[in-house]
């Protein structure tokens, strides 16, 4: 009897959708994998005889709950198929947006940059995917543990009338108000402001 | 059941222009995400561009873009794919297709309903 596929999960990012198992313990010798997806009431392969425990679904549509399933193989043995079910707009998990920041005097400049995503044009991102979508940005002075958090309208912000000659740190994620869904945050960027802008009378 | 209804293909030398159109017969084009696909000789299918309704965005692959533009008229309930500066690798069969979610431009998993195809060839 060949034992399943175990801890079978899926790990989504930003649609990119990889189907991952362990290797059961299996004294026979070395096993082999095969995975598929329902698709009109018939189950296609995917994966087929690999010796991986992963195999990229990206393919997917992304509207629709998808069953997915993988077997572990030796010789002309099989094991019973593990099933999963898989939503991937639903389930994705939003990878953090990219950022660019540039200081002018006492002021910091934000551009967010949203996701791209596996399978598709430069240009589509998870901005088109999600009509919702919106950034929050939290930024904090560095050294400290209180940090402010504010949504912007645009794909833009800029933090004015900060402290001269102090760093601070930003970062920023995605987030979906209409599902309250938020991604991962950004690596924070830390920029130290310069001068005070203002000219003395 | 929306039938997609392509036009506009033929024989072009290269760096010539063709205009393709898609119209779905007794219904409106009025769908989130409508695009071009094309599938070459003994090739798999390919994504051309797409665009959005919630937007009006376009979206195109690496390869056509610059050359080929996708738009749209709503009045007419027609898309088209107007393509300029040929090339002998853009010969294929170009087929229309529209999705009824619009999460998706570039896989065909994300279209709903597709027309039969229009041949392309650039040859001199």
């Known amino acids: 009897m060949v034992p399943p596929p175990e801890n079978v999960r899926m790990n989504s990012v930003n649609f990119k959708n990889i189907l991952q198992w362990e290797s059961p313990a299996f004294a026979k010798g070395n096993l082999t994998f095969t995975a598929q997806y329902l698709s009109y009431r018939i189950f296609q392969d995917k994966c087929m005889n690999t010796t991986l425990t992963e195999c990229d679904f990206s393919s997917l549509s992304k509207y629709g709950d998808h069953t997915l399933r993988v077997r572990a193989e030796f010789a002309d043995e099989h094991s019973d198929w593990v099933n999963i079910t898989f939503c991937p707009v639903d389930d994705t998990i939003i990878g953090p947006p990219g950022m660019q920041v540039e200081v002018l005097a006492d002021s910091l400049h934000m551009r967010f940059l949203a996701p791209k995503i596996e399978n598709e044009y430069e240009t589509w991102t998870m901005k088109n995917v999600y009509n919702s979508w919106t950034y929050n940005v939290q930024y904090w002075k560095n050294g400290t543990d209180e940090k402010f958090q504010i949504t912007p309208q645009y794909d833009f912000e800029v933090l004015r009338n900060l402290e001269p000659w102090t760093t601070y740190c930003v970062q920023v994620r995605g987030f979906l108000p209409d599902r309250n869904k938020a991604g991962e945050w950004s690596e924070p960027v830390c920029e130290q402001t310069t001068h005070d802008e203002t000219v003395p009378s | 059941e929306v039938q997609l209804v392509e036009s506009g293909g033929g024989l072009v030398q290269p760096g010539g222009s063709l205009r393709l159109s898609c119209a779905a017969s007794g219904n409106s084009l009025d769908y989130p995400t409508i695009g071009w696909f094309r599938q070459a000789p003994g090739k798999g299918l390919e994504g051309v561009s797409c665009i959005s309704a919630s937007d009006a965005s376009t979206h195109y692959a690496d390869a056509v873009k610059g050359r080929f533009t996708i738009s749209r008229d709503n009045s007419k309930n027609t898309l088209y794919l107007q393509m300029n500066s040929l090339r002998a690798e853009d010969t294929a069969v170009y087929y229309c297709?529209?999705?009824?979610?619009?999460?998706?431009?570039?896989?065909?998993?994300?279209?709903?309903?597709w027309g039969q195809g229009t041949q392309v060839t650039v040859s001199s």
């Open positions: 297709a529209a999705s009824l979610h619009g999460l998706g431009c570039k896989s065909e998993a994300d279209y709903d309903y």
